[in-house]
């Protein structure tokens, strides 16, 4: 067979056997002689052109450019293509040659113990085990362990040739951890050399690394990162790095594949990189690079080298946060910071700790936010190695939407006496002030509480035309007291006053306070009746313990069957937006109460009496009365407060102080409780005793020392008393100077 | 800018050798992997060779299996194809093509080879 | 190996009309991964092939969004709006779900 064309002037290189295939038998001699038209080589099986002991190439004798190659008593590894070519030239004549030795029917490299094939699980992937024969043609089938299976060629996918090997599917072998070739020669078996399956893959499913964002160092750490690449089983992996300073003195590289888990689709290899003293020259991005071959996938990540520790506030952290009552505030923490320095709050100074209503760290958290949570927050940052500290104050400002003080405490309709003058109050609390609280008012007809009308049982009024109480056409004479602003509870509150200048007419009337955040309104029934009165007697609020009565007195020629009811446990619920409900359609909501009658001339008076009234009596209390004539019942409301026993308490404390003799002291002693406590005053344990000098008003509130001799100093107690104890506060007077003598013989 | 540039195409007689060559400048060579496609007279595209960013995996069409050697020099930005035993059905425009997420991102312009005769 | 078809031309299509190219696959390109591996590339006469979608619908860096990629498993589809003259050229396909990669023979777009 000729290799190449012919050139204009070279012939192809002309062999002794002109034929394509030589098939002689194992032990006899080779010898073949090509001829030509310049200097000629040979290449044959097993050495490609080398210098085999046991073939000889040898100059012709009879002429110039000939060689012929000689191998006595061949083998059957001496089978295969023997060429002879040109020097430098790519025109050759080849001859295959079978040396047939039926004790070795495999050709096997002279090196090889065993071969490797590649293989991929595809279907459609054919496989090429290179277990060549010296015998063209044999009955050669595949063997593949473990488990044992045998291939035979079946004239299609799987097949076998002596000058190629074995083809099969590779999925058929896929399994296998080696193979092998075997023919049968007069029922004996031989095998080729043993071929070991590698399965390759070379999907590549991520490459991750760790620190994967957010790496810093200061000058001298040490850098490490981990570049983690998945990939499919049977995969080879080449890792990459590529970082700002290539030429690194100290870099590590170290790579290494991470243990397959039994039953995993995947696999792991890991390649870390280490840098033992980082210099500012090695910031910069780091990206490792994963490759199989057919894959390439890649990440960075930013490495940040700081000269020194540090840390500071970042530019966006907030100074001032508002916010609104119930709402979650967060508070984050910007700093710029190597490393991450440790964080402290502290409110007004004290240290805050996470509970489950506020959350401490990177960021503060309150979870739902109150007045109280009102004040300045300090976040201090420490580097955890220079220890260096920096704070920051964040105010916080929590705003309150409008709330009317007296909506929680409101009767659901009082009654007011035909003709009288009635004061409506609104009490508003809210951060910000209310910037207006308007008053509205409705006539309570308009408002009918008709079940087939009712919006719902908790808002009943269907009303919507509320108008202006400026316009006060066809209702009561009105007037709007200014706004007036009250410490109440100790908060600043705004109160707003309504005067109705004679009751003559059922209305609804409507606060309304609106500020920054919100707004809030009370709606007040104005029911005026000219039923039934109630007075209480005493008519101070009750203490608890102490006894009660409530009158309900009523016109005996025009009503009858007065009945005293309580409304409760609960006050009808009064939502925000919605109106009370009116008190005597609502009847059979009501607790029926024991009383006793009494009648003079005119009135029929029925007294509910309370003994030692407690904090479960307080609420609200109606007298229902029956007109004699039209039958139409009149219910009026009263609240009743019980107060709570309160065990004296004195409010700020008594100074010590240094005064000269002939000047004046005074001192104040402020105590509260329920009953209100009695004040006294003692010096040096001694009852104090008022005299010309010794002054004591308000109820022993305030006392004053006037022209202070040396025997007015000592120590000064006030006691505040009442049947629930006592308390006391004490100070020292020091008086100085000389005593003047008075000479008075 | 990416730039891929190859070069070393040539009339070749068949049971002949050439080696091709592919500069690369723009880009960090060492991080990609790289391949060898060649597109026929018919302007068939044909996946040739593939080579991983070290150089230590080399992928294979059956075609050139045994014939052709992919490799590359990371130090000198330059992808090899050394092919011995061409035959006529070698004949293509060879072009290089850097490779990442398995796809081909950026093409040189080609250099031609011809296998004849 | 996976068969990759596609048709020599495509519909004749006139300029600033749209037009659909179609790549049929023997063998499913969804891989288990849930991504399907067909890329799409655009070769203008006289260059060389340039990646126009990759993944079956993610559009390459630079590439205008009038190009747009779908398909099922088998069947994928590049439809391209409001065509333009740089437009023409051999569109090819290439599957990535099983080695060795095999592309289209690729489809002309055909200009009326």
């Known amino acids: 067979a000729s290799v190449g064309l012919p050139s204009v002037s070279l012939d192809l290189p002309r062999l002794s056997i002109q034929k394509d295939i030589l098939t002689i038998k194992a032990n006899t001699t080779l010898q073949i002689t090509c001829r030509g038209q310049r200097d000629l080589d040979w290449l044959w099986p097993n050495n490609q052109s080398g210098s085999e002991q046991r073939v000889e190439v040898t100059e012709c004798s009879d002429g110039l450019f000939c060689k012929t190659l000689t191998i006595p008593k061949v083998i059957g590894n001496d089978t295969g293509a023997y060429k002879c070519f040109y020097r430098e030239t790519d025109l050759a004549s080849v001859i295959y040659v079978y040396v047939q030795d039926y004790r070795s029917p495999f050709i096997a490299s002279v090196s090889d113990q065993h071969g490797v094939v590649y293989i991929t699980e595809n279907k459609n992937k054919t496989v090429v085990i290179p277990c060549l024969g010296s015998i063209s043609n044999l009955n050669v089938s595949l063997c593949a362990r473990y488990p044992e299976k045998r291939f035979v060629p079946d004239g299609n996918r799987i097949s076998w040739d002596s000058k190629k090997g074995f083809t099969i599917p590779s999925y058929m072998i896929s399994y296998a951890g080696m193979v092998f070739c075997e023919a049968k020669i007069n029922d004996e078996s031989y095998q080729s050399i043993m071929y070991i399956v590698v399965v390759v893959g070379y999907r590549i499913y991520d490459v991750v690394l760790s620190p994967s964002h957010g790496v810093e160092l200061s000058v001298g750490e040490k850098l490490v990162l981990n570049c983690t690449a998945r990939t499919e089983l049977n995969v080879g992996i080449d890792f990459n790095w590529e970082y700002p300073s290539s030429k690194h003195q100290h870099k590590k590289l170290v790579n290494r594949d991470l243990k397959t888990q039994s039953g995993s689709e995947m696999k792991k290899f890991l390649s870390t990189l280490t840098i033992d003293g980082v210099t500012r020259s090695d910031q910069g991005l780091y990206t490792c690079a994963a490759s199989s071959g057919l894959m390439t996938k890649k990440n960075s990540t930013f490495v940040r080298v700081h000269e020194k520790p540090f840390v500071a506030f970042g530019s966006g952290m907030e100074s001032l946060v508002e916010a609104t009552v119930g709402e979650r505030v967060r508070i984050p923490v910007k700093y710029l910071g190597y490393p991450p320095p440790e964080i402290k709050w502290y409110k007004n100074g004290i240290p805050l700790e996470s509970n489950h209503t506020v959350k401490v760290g990177h960021v503060l958290t309150i979870m739902e936010v109150s007045e109280r949570d009102t004040g300045n927050y300090t976040v201090i940052l420490t580097n955890p190695i220079s220890k260096e500290k920096q704070s920051h104050v964040v105010s916080l400002v929590v705003y309150v939407p409008p709330q009317i003080g007296e909506k929680s405490l409101i009767s659901p309709v009082d009654s007011y006496q035909y003709g009288t003058t009635q004061t409506l109050t609104c009490t508003v609390y809210a951060i910000p002030p209310p910037h207006h609280i308007h008053w509205y008012w409705q006539l309570e007809e308009e408002c009918p509480n008709e079940p087939s009308q009712a919006v719902s049982v908790t808002n009943p009024y269907p009303c919507e035309e509320w108008r202006s109480v400026e316009d006060f056409q066809g209702g009561n004479k009105i007037e709007v007291n200014k706004n007036q602003f009250a410490l109440i509870e100790g908060k600043n509150k705004t109160v707003s006053t309504l005067v109705i200048q004679a009751a003559n007419v059922s209305a609804l009337y409507k606060c309304e306070a609106v500020n920054k955040v919100g707004r809030g309104e009370r709606v007040i029934s104005f029911h005026v009746t000219r039923g039934p009165e109630i007075t209480l007697q005493p008519d101070l609020q009750p203490t608890e313990q102490e006894s009660v009565s409530l009158w309900c007195t009523a016109d005996k020629s025009t009503f009858e069957n007065l009945t005293w009811y309580k409304l409760g446990p609960q006050p009808l619920p009064v939502h925000v937006g919605e109106l009370p409900t009116p008190v005597c359609k609502n009847l059979d909501t009501l607790w029926k109460l024991n009383a006793t009658i009494f009648s003079n001339s005119t009135n029929d008076i029925l007294i509910m009496e309370l003994k030692n009234a407690s904090l479960q009596d307080q609420g609200d209390y109606v007298c229902v009365a029956q007109d004699r004539k039209t039958k139409k019942r009149h219910c009026v409301v009263r609240q009743l407060t019980v107060l709570e026993r309160v065990a004296p308490m004195i409010t700020g404390n008594l100074e010590n102080q240094t005064t000269s003799i002939g000047e004046t002291i005074e001192v104040s002693c402020t105590a509260s409780g329920n009953p209100p406590p009695q004040i006294m005053w003692f010096k040096d344990n001694e009852t104090l005793v008022e005299d010309s000098g010794i002054v004591l008003k308000d109820g022993n509130r305030n006392l004053t020392i006037r022209r202070v001799r040396k025997e007015d100093e000592g120590l000064y107690t006030c006691q505040a008393c009442s049947v629930l104890g006592c308390a006391k506060v004490e100070a020292f007077f020091i008086i100085e100077g000389a005593q003047e003598k008075t000479n008075l013989e | 800018e990416v730039q891929l540039v190859e070069s070393g195409g040539d009339l070749v007689k068949p049971g002949g050798s050439l080696k091709l060559s592919c500069a690369a400048s723009?880009?960090?060579?060492?991080?990609?992997?790289m391949s060898w496609v060649r597109q026929t007279p018919d302007k068939r595209l044909e996946w040739v060779a593939s080579i991983s960013i070290g150089g230590s995996y080399t992928y294979y069409a059956d075609s050139v299996e045994g014939r052709f050697t992919i490799s590359r020099e990371n130090a000198k930005n330059t992808l090899f194809l050394q092919m011995n035993s061409l035959k006529s059905e070698d004949t293509a425009l060879y072009y290089c093509?850097?490779?990442?997420?398995?796809?081909?991102?950026?093409w040189g312009h080609g250099t031609t080879l011809t296998v004849s005769s | 190996d996976v068969m990759i078809t596609q048709d020599e031309l495509s519909n004749p299509v006139t300029f600033g009309e749209s037009v659909s190219i179609s790549c049929r696959s023997s063998?499913?390109?969804?891989?288990?991964?849930?991504?399907?591996?067909l890329n799409w590339f655009l070769q203008r006469p006289g260059q060389s092939p340039q990646l126009l979608i990759y993944?079956?619908?993610t559009r390459a860096s630079g590439v205008s969004d009038r190009f747009s990629g779908s398909g099922s498993g088998t069947d994928f589809t590049l439809e391209i709006s409001r065509v333009k003259a740089e437009d023409v050229g051999i569109y090819y396909c290439?599957?990535?779900?099983?080695?060795?990669?095999?592309f289209g023979s690729g489809t002309k777009l055909e200009i009326k």
């Open positions: 290439q599957q990535l779900v099983e080695y060795p990669f095999t």
């Open positions: 063998k499913s390109l969804l891989y288990k991964d849930g991504k399907t591996y």
């Open positions: 093509a850097r490779e990442m997420d398995g796809n081909y991102d950026y």
């Open positions: 723009g880009f960090t060579f060492s991080m990609y992997g």
């Open positions: 993944l079956m619908s």
